[in-house]
Interface confidence: low
Amino acid sequence: TAATQQDFFTPNLFLKQMLERYQNNSPPNNDDQWKNNGVTKTWDRLMLQDNCCGVNGPSDWQKYTSAFRTENNDADYPWPRQCCVMNNLKEPLNLEACKLGVPGFYHNQGCYELISGPMNRH
């Protein structure tokens, strides 16, 4: 069957792109590096603006193999710092508490449910 617009906005597709390209600093070619940079910037902006983390939540960075995980030690960065609750200077309120998953210091909502709502209305 033909792919519908809805198929392109499935969480799995978002997840695959995020896991493969977010903070991937070891691409096979320059074109991929350009794409990776674009994906990283988009996700950073999304997570900061919408106060969300990953596609389904912070657990995305724990459950799946990702470029982010190969670039960052799990103990140092269980998830991107953009998942942390920020102050108005756009710096994590308390990085240690965010890393430890202390409620109130990191965003536990996934970004997909925030962006899929507006898309599903059209």
């Epitope: 102050n87 108005n88 200077l89 710096e91 994590p92 309120l93 308390n94 990085l95 240690e96």
Partner: antibody, heavy 123, light 107 residues
């Protein structure tokens, strides 16, 4: 145990210069933003200057009252914080505290304070 | 700049009392409010950060609350060693600013 020990205070004439030092120990100095906070005799506390860590390009910030006159700097290899004060005014008379920010990236809290060094600007 | 106002400059209380010190910001500071204790000898210590989080080593009789522009520090059971001046400070926006202080004395 976090320790911050200020030195370099003293009596100086208006328009004169003075350099304050702060020796830090008991923590990884190079990873923390550091601040100077002052208190004029019988008055409240006033934030003066802030310098971030190397990973944040040693970015500096100043209160308007000292901008272009004071310079904050640091020497990570010696765990030292400095405040170069030029063109001093009588209103700069105060106890100057060396202050370390708290853990994490919430820059707005001052977790550890030194005992202070007194600067008196008078003719 | 954000102005921090502590309307009560001095406060008298008895040992064992519950004491509340107030602080108001000139604009919403999103809970970025910290409290400090300054002893008569000039020693300054952080008590509470981000409105209500107790700094390490601070006795549990100290607590903080508030939101928006209005915040308070409470000492639930006043002890002799709590005699000091208490300052609030906003960490929301540079320049970081302090209240003028509330001096706590024994009745």
């Amino acid at each position: 145990e976090v320790q911050l020990v200020e030195s370099g205070g003293g009596l100086v004439q208006p328009k004169g210069s003075l350099k304050l030092s702060c020796a830090a120990s008991g923590f990884s100095f190079n990873t923390y933003a550091m601040n100077w906070v002052r208190q004029a005799p019988g008055k409240g506390l006033e934030w003066v200057a802030r310098i971030r860590s190397k990973s944040n390009n040693y970015a500096t910030y100043y209160a308007d009252s000292v901008k272009d006159r004071f310079t904050i700097s640091r020497d990570d290899s010696e765990s030292m914080l400095y405040l170069q004060m030029n063109n001093l005014k009588t209103e700069d008379t105060a106890m100057y505290y060396c202050v370390r920010q708290g853990d994490g990236y919430y820059v707005g809290w001052f977790a550890y304070w030194g005992q202070g060094t007194l600067v008196t600007v008078s003719a | 700049d954000i102005q921090m106002t502590q309307t009560t400059s001095s406060l008298s209380a008895s040992l064992g009392d519950r004491v509340t010190i107030s602080c108001r910001a000139s604009q919403d500071i999103s809970n970025y409010l910290n409290w400090y204790q300054q002893k008569p000898d000039g020693t300054v210590k952080l008590l509470i950060y981000y409105t209500s989080r107790l700094h390490s080593g601070v006795p549990s009789r100290f607590s903080g609350s508030g939101s928006g522009t209005d915040y308070s520090l409470t000492i639930s059971n006043l002890e002799q060693e709590d005699i000091a001046t208490y300052f609030c400070q906003q960490g929301n926006t540079l320049p970081f600013t302090f209240g003028s202080g509330t001096k706590l004395e024994i009745k």
